[in-house]
């Protein structure tokens, strides 16, 4: 009778096994051990027992121990099992971003790993199981559909293969993929809410802003703002689950036309835009030209107002005739022309919206002096001892010096609050002189005595 | 990490009796083959005894056959070698080791056995 | 008398290679029986220092290298050092004893 000892064993892949073999007769003919697997004798005494070193075991085997005794020859056989863990364990790859709502598909691979009868392969979000199942075919694959939530966001789901080896007295082996982070995101059908100027003007700014709502995670959104090939800049504030993004735009001449206002959306795999079309005009301000700004009272004056060729003036109110880029007026310059001014308006139609433009100029008109009777009275009566302030406004442009003097020496305290006394009394010469020339004007100071009683 | 340490060594009489454990750490002691080794004052080293990890087989050198008995108990983790009608040509240091199937690959510190009138 | 032959001594000095000799017969090395080595130094236990004829188990430095051929081994010592100083044995199987051999031992001084 031939035995074997261990009758079962299992293993780790390229492990080494003592088996052996043992015979119920004293003195066997024959006793050995048959297997393809690598073996070593141990060097022990005694004829019915000898011990073999099997190594290098890659993969189950049946070694068969024999015994040639004088009853007769028999067999027996032991079984080795390998065990190994799984050689990969891999999520097929997705993309990380996932939209909120869609079906997600997790599909595990597993290559290698025995004994298959104890390896199992579980699906996890975390640390909940969501799937488990035997690894069956090479690969084994396993799959598990996953309806993607907002809460999600951020979790990681992973592979897991156990090889359960703990009903043969050894432990629980595990072997885990790399961890696939999901993130979710909800981006709303809607597009992005673009306020700006439909219109802009060469060499100025303008504003421009983009918002969204009902969007997750908010702080993950791109925003992407651009007027035709130039990127603008944003500032982007957040909300709860929105975000609106400002940023200013300059244009140049070059920019002239009709530009492509852009403002996308980034989120996840997914994107929302919103085009809008911005006119950039050139209109500088129309041109007032005075023939002279400053004339002689009595000079003719021609007053012209030139626009944008596409722009409509009025000067001083008064439409261009025709109706047109271009108007003018003449005039006699008269003293009450000084400081008259004269104002053109351009109208520009851009993009069905009304631009206006103005510009003023002022005409100075010279003229006098004048000295009259309203401002400058020829005759005043005043009681001796009384306060009284002499006035006399002489008028011209420019401005004239004025000086009133008695005898040519004594000077009449114009604008200026006196005493009257007997002294004041007398007649004065005034003269009003400025560049434009000078007048005179005789003013007689007459002092009231009082009555004695 | 293996260790193993032997003791009952002594002075005996001519004709009497000792019994030496190893008791035996830091491996699986009921896998392991186990003798017993000696060596006399200034000499070589002798095999003595050697017994099978369950104990079910033992073997002796010639000079102690019948006199000496090796044992096991395996559930203390401990060797013993029980001599008997000892001589003086037994006084010697005893060994007691692991063998691995080829050679003696780890050795306790050894006990001394004097046997003399 | 060891059925395993030594040399009962042999010395060397510091830096220098020794070679100790174990001659046996064709029941035991001669038979296919793998030769071991063992050292022991003064007062303690034998240590394992080469088996299988030329293997070192962990821990041994590799000027320690072993050889066997046809009836006889050799264990070579190279860049002694004084704290080699101590007894090697060589150490058989013999089929015809059913026993385990080992040789007379071999003092070695630096």
């Known amino acids: 009778q031939t035995s074997v000892s261990p009758s079962k064993v299992i293993l780790p892949r390229g492990g080494s096994v003592l088996v052996t073999c043992s015979t119920s007769c004293d003195q066997p003919k024959l006793l050995g051990i048959e297997t393809p697997l690598p073996k070593k004798e141990l060097l022990l005494p005694g004829n019915n027992r000898k011990v073999y070193e099997l190594s290098n075991v890659q993969e189950d085997s049946q070694p068969m121990c024999y015994s040639n005794c004088p009853d007769g020859q028999s067999t027996a056989k032991t079984f080795l099992t390998v065990y190994w863990t799984p050689e990969r364990v891999e999520l097929a790859p997705l993309p990380s971003w996932q939209p909120v709502g869609k079906n997600l598909t997790l599909r595990c691979q597993v290559e290698g790993g025995a004994p298959r009868a104890n390896l199992t392969v579980v699906l996890l979000r975390g640390e909940k199981e969501l799937k488990r199942e035997p690894a069956v075919g090479e690969p084994a694959e396993v799959t598990t559909t996953v309806l993607v939530r907002r809460d999600h966001h951020g979790a990681n789901f992973s592979c897991r293969t156990e090889l359960d080896l703990r009903p043969q007295g050894l432990e629980l082996f595990e072997n885990t993929s790399a961890p696939y982070q999901l993130q979710t995101f909800v981006l709303p059908a809607t597009p992005p809410q673009l306020v700006s100027p439909r219109v802009l003007e060469v060499d100025t700014q303008g504003t421009v802003v983009c918002s969204l709502d009902g969007l997750f995670p908010v702080s993950e959104a791109q925003v992407h703002l651009a007027l035709g090939d130039q990127r603008l800049n944003p500032t982007v504030t957040y909300g709860n689950d929105s975000f609106s993004a400002k940023a200013s735009v300059s244009v140049t001449a070059e920019d002239e036309g009709t530009q492509r206002l852009t403002c996308a959306v980034i989120l996840g795999n997914q994107s929302q835009e919103t085009l809008q079309t911005v006119t950039i005009y050139s209109f500088p301000a129309p041109n007032v030209i005075l023939t002279k700004p400053e004339v002689s009272e009595g000079t003719e004056v021609t007053v012209k107002c030139e626009a944008h060729p596409r722009a409509k003036v009025t000067l001083n109110g008064v439409p261009a005739q025709p109706l047109g880029p271009r108007a003018q007026l003449l005039l006699k310059a008269t003293p009450e022309d000084n400081g008259r001014s004269f104002s053109c308006s351009a109208t520009l139609e851009v993009a069905g919206q009304l631009i206006h433009k103005n510009q003023t100029r002022e005409l100075r008109v010279l003229y006098g002096p004048r000295l009259d009777e309203r401002d400058c009275p020829g005759n005043w009566t005043w009681p001796e001892n009384s306060q009284q302030t002499p006035m006399c406004q002489a008028w011209g442009n420019p401005l004239p010096e004025l000086k009133c003097l008695k005898d040519g020496t004594f000077p009449l305290p114009i604008g200026e609050s006196v005493t009257v006394t007997r002294d004041l009394e007398g007649t004065y010469l005034c003269r009003a002189r400025s560049t434009q020339g000078e007048v005179t004007r005789k003013v007689t100071v007459n002092v009231l005595s009082p009555r004695y009683e | 990490e293996v260790q193993l340490l032997e003791s009952g060594g002594g002075l005996v009489q001519p004709g009497g009796s000792l019994r030496l454990s190893c008791a035996a750490s830091g491996f699986t002691f009921s896998n392991a083959w186990m003798s017993w080794v000696r060596q006399a004052p200034g000499k070589g080293l002798e095999w003595v005894a050697f017994?099978?990890?369950?104990?079910?087989?033992?073997y002796y050198a010639d000079s102690v056959k019948g006199r000496f008995t090796i044992s096991r108990d395996n559930s203390k983790n401990t060797l013993y070698l029980q001599m008997n009608s000892l001589r003086a040509e037994d006084t010697a240091v005893y060994y007691c080791?692991?063998?691995?199937?080829?050679?003696?690959?780890?050795w306790g510190q050894g006990t001394l056995v004097t046997v003399s009138s | 008398q060891s059925v395993l032959t030594q040399p009962p001594s042999a010395s060397g000095t510091p830096g220098q290679r020794v070679t100790i000799s174990c001659t046996g017969s064709?029941?035991?090395?001669?038979?296919?029986?793998?030769v071991h080595w063992y050292q022991q130094l003064p007062g303690t236990a034998p240590k394992l220092l080469i088996y299988?004829?030329?293997n070192r188990p962990s821990g041994v430095p590799d000027r320690f290298s072993g050889s066997k051929s046809g009836t006889s081994a050799s264990l070579a010592i190279s860049g002694l050092r004084s704290e080699d100083e101590a007894d090697y044995y060589c150490q058989s199987y013999d089929s015809s004893l059913s026993a385990w051999l080992f040789g007379g031992g071999t003092k070695l001084t630096v």
């Open positions: 064709s029941s035991n090395i001669g038979a296919g029986y793998d």
């Open positions: 080791a692991r063998y691995s199937g080829w050679y003696f690959d780890y």
């Open positions: 299988d004829n030329n």
């Open positions: 017994i099978w990890y369950d104990g079910s087989n033992k």
